[in-house]
């Protein structure tokens, strides 16, 4: 931004500048250019010997300027365009200035003035241009500063040229008031801080409802000596509840919200929220809907799921496979998990209690993501009730629970009681027994054995009797042996795993029971 202190051309001849000597030399004249009247100060004493004609401006108030720019538009005639070359003719003039705190009026003293420069034209007006009225306009600019007094004068010294001053413009530069990145920067006088620091650092202030982001830098810009803003640093962001609209922050409209200072716009209130008021930072959940602590405010409010669908319990001897389907209502969430709990009841006494400690699950029964689980190590002659609860991220925010139950009675055999009957270096004779009342239900017995420490291979023998001899074994080797009854319903309870050792080739070893 240029702040003009003096503009001769704009004054249309109304500036009465001082000429010295009075009535000679410089003269105010009017001409027609492009069908418009134009005023100029002119002098053309090219055949009268040495000249010393001065033209002084009126006193110019400095305002805030520290350095001023002087722009001159002028024309100079070619000395060769005059008859005989006009021997005393010159083609330059001198520019001077003087600072003062007061206007001296018509009191003009050359010694008060300091020379700024000799002004020479880039183009002179030759005869043909003059005749054709082609004004060869020269533009020269000079900078003066630092200025310290209240005001100043400019002066033009003619030393025998044929020159016309068409424009004298004096201005200083400011970086204009500016809005950048939601920060307001004040109008700033363009001045070099020092020779090594040609930029003035200016702090901006965030516009209404804008803030410096947490941990970020406040807005800064640099004002150059040319009055231009450079190198923005930092920024302001619209605070929560407000969004950027052009260079301002506007409150979120009703039904919209913004939860943090950011560059993003206000978002529409998500599903299952109550309509927000203007400038909302969040949208409240409808009754019965909730937000988990980790849920973003942009996410719909959700609710706990309904119970799992179609829970079935399929008994397989001493095992039960539980299967269910996902809840009909997920509550609007994807993070559904299931928990299985177990209760066992003794038919004789009707007593019931938790059975988590005595049964084995195919995977941990809490936070299940799949919709099936196998429960094994069930006790015979026991009634079991399994509850499958569906939970999601907001289930913890309510006291009610969503579960479905299924019951199953275990009629399988008791586990066989196993013992080692005999052994040799290459064989083991094993016997077992079960209660007589259950023997009719047993179809066969399955004996599983393997070397201790060898998890990769095992052997299975089936028999209808109550004993088996395991042959072709390695001497002096411990084997793991388990016996399980097979019934029409499937596998019965398995015995515990026993460790039996074959004899060494030396022949003496203790029997392991």
């Amino acid at each position: 931004k240029e702040v003009v202190l003096l503009d001769f051309a704009a004054m249309k001849g109304e500036l009465g500048w001082l000429t010295h000597p009075y009535g000679k030399g410089w003269d105010l004249m009017q001409n027609i250019m492009d069908d418009m009247p134009i005023y100029m100060y002119s002098v053309c004493n090219v055949v009268s010997g040495d000249q010393d004609n001065w033209l002084r401006t009126n006193w110019v108030y400095r305002e805030e300027a520290e350095r001023i720019f002087i722009e001159l538009k002028f024309t100079v005639r070619d000395c060769n365009s005059f008859p005989g070359g006009a021997s005393s003719c010159k083609e330059t003039f001198n520019l001077y200035y003087a600072e003062s705190d007061v206007d001296y009026g018509t009191n003009f003293q050359k010694r008060q003035f300091t020379k700024i420069d000799t002004i020479a034209p880039d183009e002179i007006t030759v005869s043909s241009d003059f005749e054709a009225r082609n004004v060869k306009l020269n533009v020269e600019e000079r900078m003066v500063g630092p200025l310290t007094r209240k005001g100043f004068y400019l002066a033009f010294q003619d030393i025998g040229a044929c020159v016309a001053l068409l424009s004298v413009r004096v201005y200083y530069k400011k970086c204009p008031e500016m809005l950048q990145s939601l920060a307001r920067f004040p109008e700033t006088i363009a001045v070099a801080v020092s020779d090594t620091q040609p930029l003035a650092t200016v702090a901006g202030t965030c516009v209404d409802h804008a803030v410096v982001p947490y941990g970020g830098e406040g807005p800064l810009m640099h004002c150059t000596v040319d009055g231009e803003w450079l190198v923005p640093i930092g920024q302001c962001l619209c605070q929560e509840g407000y969004e950027k609209v052009e260079d301002a922050c506007r409150a979120c409209s009703p039904g919209f919200f913004k939860s943090e200072a950011s560059e993003s716009p206000c978002l529409e209130c998500p599903e299952h929220t109550l309509p927000s008021t203007e400038g909302a930072t969040s949208c409240q959940c409808e009754e019965g809907y909730f937000r988990a602590p980790e849920d973003p405010l942009s996410m719909s409010c959700t609710r706990p799921p309904s119970a799992p669908n179609y829970l079935t319990a399929i008994g397989m001897g001493a095992k039960v496979e539980l299967r269910w389907t996902a809840p009909k209502d997920t509550g609007g969430r994807q993070d559904i998990v299931y928990s299985v709990t177990c209760e066992q009841c003794w038919p004789e006494s009707g007593e019931c209690g938790p059975c988590e400690a005595s049964v084995r699950y195919s995977e941990p029964p809490h936070a299940l993501t799949r919709t099936s689980v196998t429960v094994s190590d069930l006790e015979p002659h026991m009634n079991y009730t399994f509850a499958v609860e569906a939970r999601n991220g907001v289930s913890g925010l309510v006291t009610s629970r969503s579960f479905r139950t299924a019951s199953v009675s275990i009629n399988q055999t008791e586990p066989p009681k196993v013992r080692l009957e005999d052994r040799s270096t290459t064989s083991l004779s094993v016997t077992w027994s079960i209660p007589v009342s259950q023997q009719s239900r047993v179809w066969k017995y399955e004996v599983t054995y393997r070397k201790k420490g060898d998890a990769n291979s095992y052997n299975v023998r089936r028999t209808e009797g109550f004993s088996v001899t395991l042959d072709d074994l390695a001497p002096d080797t411990t084997y793991l042996v388990q016996v399980q009854a097979l019934t029409q319903e499937g596998q019965g309870a398995g015995s515990k795993v026993h460790e039996f050792q074959t004899l060494s080739t030396e022949g003496s070893a203790n029997m392991a029971v």
């Epitope: 027609i32 002119s42 090219v46 024309t75 003059f130 004004v135």
Partner: antibody, heavy 128, light 107 residues
Framework: EVQLLESGGGLVQPGGSLRLSCAAS????????MAWVRQAPGKGLEWVSR????????HYADSVKGRFTISRDNSKNTLYLQMNSLRAEDTAVYYC?????????????????????WGQGTLVTVSS | DIQMTQSPSTLSASVGDRVTITCRAS??????LAWYQQKPGKAPKLLIY???NLHTGVPSRFSGSGSGTEFSLTISGLQPDDFATYYC?????????FGQGTKVEIK
Amino acid sequence: EVQLLESGGGLVQPGGSLRLSCAASGFTFSHYMMAWVRQAPGKGLEWVSRIGPSGGPTHYADSVKGRFTISRDNSKNTLYLQMNSLRAEDTAVYYCAGYDSGYDYVAVAGPAEYFQHWGQGTLVTVSS
Amino acid sequence: DIQMTQSPSTLSASVGDRVTITCRASQSISTWLAWYQQKPGKAPKLLIYKASNLHTGVPSRFSGSGSGTEFSLTISGLQPDDFATYYCQQYNSYSRTFGQGTKVEIK
């Protein structure tokens, strides 16, 4: 010494034509703007037409526009005025005048010109 | 066209007198004004251009002044050779109009 010598004047009937000449000497003719100025008997001066140093541009007074044509031949140092459709009110002494920008000690030329050098004039009489 | 009006039309004066002729323009012509002297049966002669600039060879008793619409020609110390008719001419526009003339005669 600058000299301008007009010729070609005389008596002519209304509607007739005449061609005036102006022979120049003592200066560089091709540097000068040239003009014709007339003066009716016992009256003041009236500018008629002008022509630039190299033959253009040309300007005419409203009273003669379309009837008179100004021209020059720089190789012959001669200025001409072709006058057609002459009227009684064209009766006057016709002066050839010149202007040299070199003698105009101003930084910017005026919108038009004045006349530094004049011939002695030639009389044109339009009468039946 | 710009009209130029001179006054007086005739001026009677004696040798040594200071005489002033005025010229008024119908609109502003800045300082684009010339003055001529014409003697009977002779061609006009340029005296002053740009309102106040003396043409080469013209005696310094002649001076011109004015700007805009009001101009004057002053002869300080009238000489016998100065009795003639004087014309002003504007050259602010292409019409280059003359005043009607002022005759300076012997009183």
